[in-house]
């Protein structure tokens, strides 16, 4: 899978990074950058909607490890964490969108680094031509919601969202080209992942250029 | 029932040590938890001081720095403190305590047994 | 380090009366407060922790709330073994620390 980097990422002003993280790939968060040898305890909250909060926690004195309420075994420490503090998400579900917070004991009070994680999915994007001079362009089940948008503009109808259990929706826009003497329209899907750029040509097939899904990360 | 008692000089000379011991019954102190010092001023104000734990391993509080040490005697089931270069201001009733079981190893930093305190004065 | 300041600093009341006595935080602790009595001679009692969870042993008539910096010890329908000195302590990070104490007083 593909690794996640962390240039992706925005830090608030409290210090929580918002981090948004391709569905399949392999998350690596980090605690901050305290010496180890003034830790006395590192603890990782992970808060996921739905379900009770889980820690991972870790006692440096009595090099001892306890877990609450943690069950999903795709989050791990990267390693034992006198080694390495870091929490893996391997690989990333959908389920995984939440709030990671590393915490770190040490004699001089507790430091933070708290994680939002949007997990992202890459919407599968299909653009047709359903009557005449009438053209539909769907984006299948992304996260979040893709953006589309015509080159040239038509006369759309309203963009609708269809919301699924999983947090993924489609997003569907169909335009007509009445009036228009375009011969050729081009769908435009923007979304976190990667935009794609689709066309057709009206009362004719369907051709596709632009940027394929996961360019931008 | 966990029992903690104090005992040590009640009278210290500025400059000098002060050694205070905490003899714990109904328990034993490498099967489990924090001990720990702490001390009420005169006026009412507490501290805490430090910690070993069952392994025997130690934290202080970094204000106090290296004038603090916390050892422990595992034949007797005792733990110490001992303060160095004491002055006027360190005058108060010291106190050992445990601390309550941990369930996640942070945020469970409370005292659930303590002994009753013994006072100490620092005056030449 | 985490200042801890607690009020009133003495309190005078019937048995049988309510009380409160509040403890404010410099920062955000969350619910990690813990309250304490203590009482001359006799080894000082944990009875609540986490903000509001009562220790064992301790009776119902004690109840803690509060959340973030503000933080109330309430006794309800005090008995005459309530009296003495009520301390909070913050366990949410090293170093702890303790309020200034509060001294309950038969009125």
């Known amino acids: 899978g593909k690794q996640m980097t962390q240039n992706y990422s925005k830090m608030s002003a409290e210090g929580n990074i918002s981090q948004p993280v391709l569905m399949d790939t392999n998350a690596n968060l980090c605690c901050p950058p305290i010496e180890f040898r003034n830790l006395i305890v590192i603890v990782w909250e992970i808060i996921i909607r739905g379900q009770p909060s889980c820690t991972k926690a870790y006692r440096k004195e009595t090099n001892e490890t306890k877990e609450t309420n943690c069950t999903d075994k795709r989050i791990t420490w990267v390693s034992t964490p006198d080694q390495n503090s870091d929490l893996q998400i391997h690989p990333v579900a959908i389920t995984h969108d939440g709030y990671y917070r590393c915490i770190m004991a040490t004699p001089d009070g507790n430091f933070h680094r708290g994680y939002h994680l949007q997990v992202l999915v890459t919407p599968e994007v299909t653009l047709f031509q359903s009557r005449n001079r009438t053209a539909v362009c769907k984006a299948v089940a992304g996260k979040p919601a893709a953006q589309i948008s015509w080159i040239p503009a038509g006369d759309c109808a309203p963009t609708e969202h269809e919301y699924w259990g999983n947090g993924t929706v489609t997003v569907e826009s169909m335009c007509h080209w009445g009036d228009h003497n375009a011969s050729t329209v081009t769908c435009h899907v923007s979304h976190l992942t990667g935009n794609k750029s689709l066309y057709i040509k009206l009362n004719s097939g369907l051709r596709t250029s632009g940027s394929p899904a996961l360019d931008l990360l | 029932e966990i029992q903690l008692q104090e005992s040590g000089p009640g009278l210290v000379k500025p400059s000098q040590s002060l050694s205070l011991t905490c003899s714990v019954t109904g328990y034993t102190i490498t099967s489990g938890y924090d001990w720990s010092w702490i001390r009420k001023f005169p006026g009412n104000k507490m501290e805490w001081m430090g910690y070993?734990?069952?392994?025997?391993?130690?934290n202080y509080k970094p204000s106090l720095g290296s004038r603090i040490s916390i050892t422990r005697d595992t034949s007797k089931n005792q733990f110490f403190l001992q303060l160095n270069s004491v002055s006027p201001e360190d005058t108060a009733t010291y106190y050992c305590a445990k601390y309550n079981e941990y369930k996640s190893y942070i945020y469970d930093w409370y005292f659930d047994f303590w002994g009753p305190g013994t006072m100490v004065t620092v005056s030449s | 380090e985490v200042q801890m300041t607690q009020s009133p600093s003495t309190l005078t009341a019937s048995p049988g009366e309510s009380v409160s006595i509040n403890c404010k935080a410099s920062?955000?602790?969350?619910?990690?407060l813990a309250w304490y009595q203590q009482k001359p001679g006799k080894p000082n009692k944990l009875l609540i922790y986490?903000?509001?969870t009562l220790h064992s042993g301790t009776p119902s008539r004690f109840s803690g709330s509060g959340f973030g910096t503000d933080f109330t010890l309430t006794i309800r329908n005090l008995e005459p073994e309530d009296f003495g000195l009520y301390y909070c302590q913050q366990h949410h990070e090293y170093p702890l620390t303790f309020g200034s104490g509060t001294k309950l007083e038969i009125k």
């Open positions: 070993i734990n069952y392994g025997g391993s130690t």
């Open positions: 920062k955000n602790i969350r619910s990690y």
């Open positions: 986490s903000g509001s």
